[in-house]
Structure formats: C-alpha cells, structure tokens
C-alpha cells in the first residue's frame, strides 16, 4: 500500500542496504524511491545525534515483508518509498538549503551574483550534481559570492555539514531545465573509448541508454549486442564518462552500439520505463517468486504489482499442460538489472512497469494516426481540449493542450474581453462539439496566467496557462503532450499536425468534429518574406503549404501544433495568427513553445 507520510522520531530497525547523505527527509524519500531495492528509509536529523558526522544520514532499507520494526528515536524521521504509490514521481528537487554545505568533489569555482545563478550554472554544467554558494554575508571575504560546482560518484553528497551563510542545492537537470545539448541518436558499429564507471547487463541499446540516463555519473555508453564476438561481453552495457563530457574518441566495431545519456531531455522521453518484451530470452537474477500465469503480459502485470520485483522471465506452457499456464519467474538484483541474459531459451522476459510512473505521462504511446481524411477519431489527439465561454451564451472559444494534470496551455489572445476565469469551462476527451450537453462534465478554471509581455498575437508572447480547479485523471482519451526539450534545438520536425474545431475557411462556422491537417514547418527566414509588415521573431514558428489549402483558422487559436519525433509527440506550437486562412504563401504563425519552456515550468512548478 502507498504510505506517503513521514514518521517523526521513529527509526526503522534493520534492513540496511545503503547509507547516503541527504539535506532533508523529503529528499531521502525521493532517493529511496529511485534506488532499485529501497522500500523504507530512516533519516537522521541534527537533533538525533551528538555526532555531527551522523547528521543528514539517509539509511536506505529493504524488507521481504515490506515493513520493519519501529523504534522510538528523537530526531529520526522514517518513511516508505513511493514505489508502492501510483502517482507521478519526480527526481526534481528545486529546494535551496540554507546554512548547509553538501560535500563532494569541488571541480569548479567561480563568482555568481546569486544562489539562483549558481544553480543555473550547475544545471547547465554536464558534470554538476549539486552546488554550494557562499552568500555575501559569508565571513571570509575572498569566498563571498563563490559558486562551487560539485559532483560525486553516486550523485549524492559524501557528507553534509552545517555552515553559516552558505546555501546548497541540486542541479535541475531532472526538472528538464538544462540547456545542454541532447543527443538522441544511437550510433551503430561504434565503441566509445573512455573510462567505464559501471557496467550492467541490458537486452538492447535502448535499455542501456535508459540505465545510463538515470545513473548520476553516466554521460554516454557503449553496448555490446547479442552478436558481439566475445561471448562474455554480450549484452554488456558500459556506462562511461570523460572530462570533457563527450567521447574523446570512437572506435568502429561491428555489433557494438553507442549513445548518450538523455539527462538533458529527460522530461520528454521514457527514461525509466522499459516496456518491451524480449522473446527467446531469459533474465537471470535472484528469484522472488514463481507463479503459474497465462501469458507474458500477465507475468509482467504480476511483476509490476509485486513491489520488490524488478524483472521477470516467463516460461510458456508446454503444449496443453496446466490449462495453458506457463511459469512466471519474478526476479530482482542489487542494481535492478539482470545478472546475466541468456538467449535461445524459449523464455519471454521483461521489466516491471512500476517505474513508468517516474517518466512523464506524455511519453506514453497513443493509438496510431489515421491516415487520410480531415476528421479525427477518438483518442487520436488526447491532449486537445475545447475551451468554452459561458458568457453571454455558451460556445467554443479556443483550443488548448493538456500539459499537466492541472494545466492547459493555450494562446493569450483567447482571453480578450474575458473578465473572470469563472465564465470558462474546459472540456477534455471530446471529439464532437455535439457531445457537450448541459450535464457534460467539465473542468473549471482556477486561474488564467497570461504572459506578462503579451500585447497582441502578432507581436508575440501569445501564450497563456489555465490552472484547473481539479486534477485530470489520465486515460487513453485524455493525457498530456510533451513540451519540446530545450536540448532539442537542432531537431527538425517533419511530422507536424494542427488540430481544432475552427473554421474550414475564412467565412465559416465552428466544426462539430475535431479536424486535423498535416502541415510542414517553414523556416523563419521564409516566413518573414511572406509577412513583410510583421516581425517574425525566434519566439514564433511558422507552418503551411506554399500553395495554401491547409491551415489553422478562426476557432483553432490556442490549440496545438503537434509534432512527432522519436515516437513521442511534442507541443511545438500554439495556434496564434496568420493572414486569412490557408492562403497561398501565407503560412500560419504559431507561438514557438520551445522558447517558453522555462516560463511554463516556472509557472506550473511554482
């Protein structure tokens, strides 16, 4: 069961698997959640011990029974990992800790105006895990305003000390706030020849990449495939680092693949979730249980529901034995990866899906696109919402996109003349406007957040957030779309669609069924030539056919320009403005969401 509360002055006895240092019990709980085996923890605060070296210790614990004896101890704080919970889990920690110094290797020292600037520097430095900043009140004059960037092998401090007039905090890479480049390509027949920091077994290069991404020290990796000539190295995933943060050299080798950690583009790509099945494959590890079930999907479900299960192997039933039930071997290991991978065994293996909740929901695969036609089908664009106004009478006002369980992203110009959020209704999971009746459930709007630099659509900053009064439960027909990753500036999107209930031509009416159109992106230079009287800024993005014919139009405003890249849909643009609709050589102009990712995160994570 999911227990989120912390138990003050309680110590969990036994079950120790590791000790780390964390600045708070809350952070200790997050570390426990991300550890492959930790189910419970005890955090030692300042008052729990006379010995300062014991302060801020976070003892990670495991238990076969999923519980441990409780002992009263002043200053200790204990709790359970979030592994048992179904809610989204994030490693993002924006907290700044006052009068604490997290210890690590101080590899970079520079002047900074503020703790925030120091944290940004850490976030944009490939090696940085956390930082300490000496404030302007720091006693030693020559150390004032010094920003120390730090890293450790584990990503957690090697110790935490009380120190007056300093502040400390973590890199915000896991909050998707890094400006570092994000290299998604996997390079075939390539070995990166740099120092190995760890090695694990993986069934393919993509699992190897995910392991690298959430390993704090891993910057890139090399994976030896099943066909690799040296048998002892088959399925071996080498986690690597280098001083520069990039491979110093590459060696061409058949049957090896290499790639990069996705730590800088983490929020829009599945990192923790290994959802594939590996046929004719056995994962070896410590056996947790053996259960008779029908099929490998049922086996995966069993593993997902068993909190200690990390991976499984399903041995299909022989002929008609045992009512078609095969054996489901639930397994675990010290690091969450199989200790060995065997091929040609007839088994079907895979991983728990419990870790999927650590990934952003927006990375979930949705049903395939319906090719041809202009009318959408249910579940095709599950992030698309219809925003209604009830004043003077109820009508469709604008489109919008779900980007979080309480957040809709739309255009600022939609709210011209809207006096209060009370007159707004957000309908989610809607295909046809005719579905909306008096008793149709909707989401009220708690707050409208318009970009403070917005004046009019044509001059940019045409972006707004709606905070919903209640949270959205994600289903196949209503789920979020990923924001573009800041590390993806070089990506050229080739599969982009505009959707909405807007007019089909300039003088028309709102459509009943959600319409879709595939539209190519146009460079800003090209777009500027088409709109000589306007300034097309880098905060805008244009899309349209040279000959016209397909475009967003009145009523589509605020809706998404959705682009698919690497199997994940990204909200690349917000329908903003254009000259007429679908006119020749007049592309549609959209708010360039990439340029507002920081603004969105600042407002939604405040």
């Amino acid at each position: 069961e999911c227990v989120t509360r912390l138990f003050k002055d309680i110590h969990f006895e036994g079950g120790d698997i590791a000790t780390v240092f964390t600045p708070s019990a809350k952070h200790c709980q997050v570390v426990c959640t991300h550890h492959p085996r930790c189910l419970l923890f005890t955090f030692t605060g300042e008052s729990a011990s006379e010995d300062p070296t014991q302060w801020f210790t976070c003892v990670l614990k495991d238990s076969v029974t999923e519980t441990l004896p409780r002992v009263n101890r002043t200053g200790a704080i204990s709790g359970y990992s979030f592994k048992q919970c179904s809610h989204q889990i994030s490693a993002c920690n924006k907290d700044i800790y006052v009068d604490l110094d997290m210890k690590g290797i101080n590899y970079n020292s520079s002047l900074a105006k503020s703790a925030q600037e120091c944290q940004e520097r850490c976030t944009d430095d490939i090696h940085c895990h956390f930082f300490t900043y000496a404030t302007r009140q720091f006693p030693s004059l020559e150390h004032r305003n010094i920003c120390l960037l730090k890293h450790t092998q584990t990503g957690t401090p090697t110790g935490i000390m009380k120190l007056d007039k300093v502040v400390t905090g973590f890199s915000l890479k896991s909050c998707a706030l890094s400006n570092l480049a994000c290299i998604r390509d996997v390079f075939p027949n390539t070995v990166f020849a740099d120092s190995n920091i760890d090695s694990v077994m993986a069934p393919d290069a993509f699992v190897c990449r995910r392991i690298c991404t959430h390993h704090p020290g891993c910057l890139f990796f090399t994976f030896f495939s099943q066909e690799w000539p040296k048998e002892s190295q088959r399925n071996l995933c080498l986690l690597k680092t280098s001083e520069s943060g990039l491979p110093s050299t590459r060696i061409k080798k058949s049957k090896a693949l290499s790639g990069f950690s996705l730590q800088s583009c983490r929020h829009s790509i599945p990192v923790f979730c290994h959802s594939s099945f590996y046929h004719d494959t056995d994962f070896l590890g410590e056996e947790l249980d053996i259960v008779a079930v029908k099929g490998h999907e049922a086996c995966q479900k069993l593993c997902t529901n068993a909190v200690r299960c990390q991976f499984f192997t399903y041995a299909p039933a022989q002929a008609s034995c045992n009512e078609g039930k095969g054996k489901c071997y639930l397994k675990l290991s010290s690091n969450g990866s199989p200790t060995k991978i065997l091929r040609g065994t007839g088994g079907i293996s895979g991983y728990t899906l419990r870790l999927c909740k650590m990934d952003n929901e927006c990375t979930t695969k949705i049903k395939p696109r319906i090719v041809g036609g202009t009318a959408s089908v249910r579940g095709e664009w599950p992030w698309q919402v219809t925003l209604h106004t009830t004043s003077p009478t109820q009508r469709h006002l604008c489109g919008g996109s779900i980007i979080g369980n309480q957040w809709i992203l739309t255009a600022a110009h939609c709210f011209y003349g809207v006096e209060s959020p009370k007159i707004l209704r957000v309908y989610i999971g809607i295909l046809n406007q005719s579905e909306i009746k008096e008793d149709t459930s909707f989401f009220g709007v708690q707050e409208i957040i318009i970009h403070d630099q917005y004046k009019m659509a044509e001059s940019g900053y045409d972006i707004a957030l709606l905070k919903l009064e209640t949270t959205v439960n994600y289903t196949d027909s209503q789920r979020p779309i990923c924001l573009p990753s800041k590390g993806d500036r070089n990506v050229i999107y080739t599969d982009c669609w505009v959707t909405g209930w807007g007019y089909r031509k300039l003088r028309d009416k709102i459509q009943n069924t959600l319409q879709k159109a595939k539209i190519p992106l146009v460079t800003n230079d090209e777009c500027q030539k088409r709109y000589r009287g306007h300034k097309i800024t880098h905060k805008m993005i244009c899309a349209g056919y040279r000959e016209g014919g397909k475009d967003a139009c009145k009523g589509d405003s605020g809706g998404p320009l959705s682009c698919k890249h690497n199997e994940v849909w990204h909200l690349v643009g917000i329908t903003s403005w254009g000259e007429g609709c679908a006119q020749r050589e007049r592309p549609g102009v959209y708010t360039n969401v990439l340029e507002y990712v920081d603004w969105i995160l600042e407002k939604t994570q405040a």
């Epitope: 390539t190 990039l246 590459r250 060696i251």
Partner: antibody, heavy 125, light 107 residues
Framework: QVQLQESGPGLVKPSQTLSLTCTVS??????????WSWIRQHPGKGLEWIGS???????YYNPSLKSRVTISVDTSKNQFSLKLSSVTAADTAVYYC?????????????????WGQGTTVTVSS | DIQMTQSPSSVSASVGDRVTITCRAS??????LAWYQQKPGKAPKLLIY???SLQSGVPSRFSGSGSGTDFTLTISSLQPEDFATYYC?????????FGGGTKVEIK
C-alpha cells in the same frame, strides 16, 4: 543528388581565424546516418583529416589541430562550418568538406562518398 | 594515431596492366578501410569501402582485399582514366588517417 559547396575567404592573414562554410544541397544534413567532415591537402601533399561533426553536434577533431579547431552545424541552413584559429603559413592548403557515411542501417556503407570541389586558402600577410 | 603506410609511392604502368597498391596499418583496423582516387585539381572520389566493397558507379576493374593490418587495391586492367593518385584511409579509430598516396603514372 547530394552536393557540397565550400565557401569562405581565399586569403587569411597570419594569426587570424580561418572560417569556411560548407552548404549541403540536394539532401538534408539532418540525418543520423552521416558525419560531415573537413579535410585539407597541403600543396603537393597528401590528405589530412581535420575533424567531423554529426547533425546532433557531436564532434571529433584531429588531436594535432584540436586546440585551434571548431566545427559547428546549422541544421536550419543545411550548413556546417570550420573555424581554425591562429593560422600560420603552414595552414595554406586546399580545404575540402565531405559527407562521411556512418549508416545506421547496419554494416553496409562507409567512407566519404560525397566531396566538395575544394577551396584554396592561402595564409599570407 | 594509426599510421597508414602505402606502397609503392608511385608506379609506372601501361593501359591494360594489372596494378596492385598495398596499404599497411600500424595496428589492426578490422575491415574499416576505404580507398580513394584523386586526379589533379579535383576532389578525391570514393572507390572502395569496408576494405572490399565497391562503391556504386565505380567500374568492376577496381577491387579491394585485406583485413586487420594489410590491405590491397587492385586495378585489373588499367584504363587511361585511371591515371591518378590513390589514397587509403582508415576509419576504425578517430583520428581518421590517410596513407601518403600512390601515384599511378603512364609508362
């Protein structure tokens, strides 16, 4: 088919920075299957690899030039560029850009299959 | 860095002759080797990749062989348009390196 065209000044003063651009036409620079390379050839001599870049920004440089070389890519303009700082007369050469195939589909096709026609750069005051 | 040594540095031959150029790597490079042809004032042209694979559009009189450290480019019957300089190139490990070149001249 894909064509490459080098552009940039033919004469550079010593100690200055040599800047060349290679424009890719007839195909996209935005592909995981290629590295985009710079090679030079001193008068009457053999070929010397300077460095390569992937559209993602991943670069490799010749260690003998690494401290002076920067290769960058601009996917929106379908171009990649070379900057060589602190040049001397020894950097006088014909500079070529080339497409280096690193095919993601397997082992089948490698090597620098498309080259620019080359641009002569003279370093002289 | 891997040194690539080509021999001979020049060869005189007549039309119809069989010409063999060798290339030796200072360490094993598997089959990650390419051969290029360069004519005066022109850019190099890829002939062979992966030691023995013929680049499309290249006449079948050109062939490559070898693996590890020793490689050979053979022109089975020299044609007038084949008089040029030939370079081998390893791409097994960065930095990519070229051989010094072999000039095939008219006898």
């Amino acid at each position: 088919q894909v064509q490459l065209q080098e552009s940039g000044p033919g004469l550079v003063k010593p100690s200055q920075t040599l800047s060349l651009t290679c424009t890719v036409s007839g195909g996209s620079i935005y592909s995981g299957a290629y590295y985009w390379s710079w090679i030079r050839q001193h008068p009457g001599k053999g070929l010397e690899w300077i460095g390569s870049i992937h559209y993602s920004g991943l670069t490799y440089y010749n260690p003998s030039l690494k401290s002076r070389v920067t290769i960058s890519v601009d996917t929106s303009k379908n171009q990649f560029s070379l900057k060589l700082s602190s040049v001397t007369a020894a950097d006088t050469a014909v500079y070529y850009c080339a497409r280096d195939v690193d095919d993601s589909s397997g082992d089948e096709h490698y090597g620098m299959d498309v080259w620019g026609q080359g641009t002569t750069v003279t370093v002289s005051s | 860095d891997i040194q690539m040594t080509q021999s001979p540095s020049s060869v005189s031959a007549s039309v119809g002759d069989r010409v063999t150029i060798t290339c030796r790597a200072s360490q094993g490079i598997d089959s990650w080797l390419a051969w290029y042809q360069q004519k005066p004032g022109k850019a190099p042209k890829l002939l062979i990749y992966a030691a023995s694979s013929l680049q499309s559009g290249v006449p079948s009189r050109f062939s490559g062989s070898g693996s590890g450290t020793d490689f050979t480019l053979t022109i089975s019957s020299l044609q007038p348009e084949d008089f040029a300089t030939y370079y081998c190139q390893q791409y097994h490990i960065v930095p990519i390196t070229f051989g010094g070149g072999t000039k095939v001249e008219i006898k």
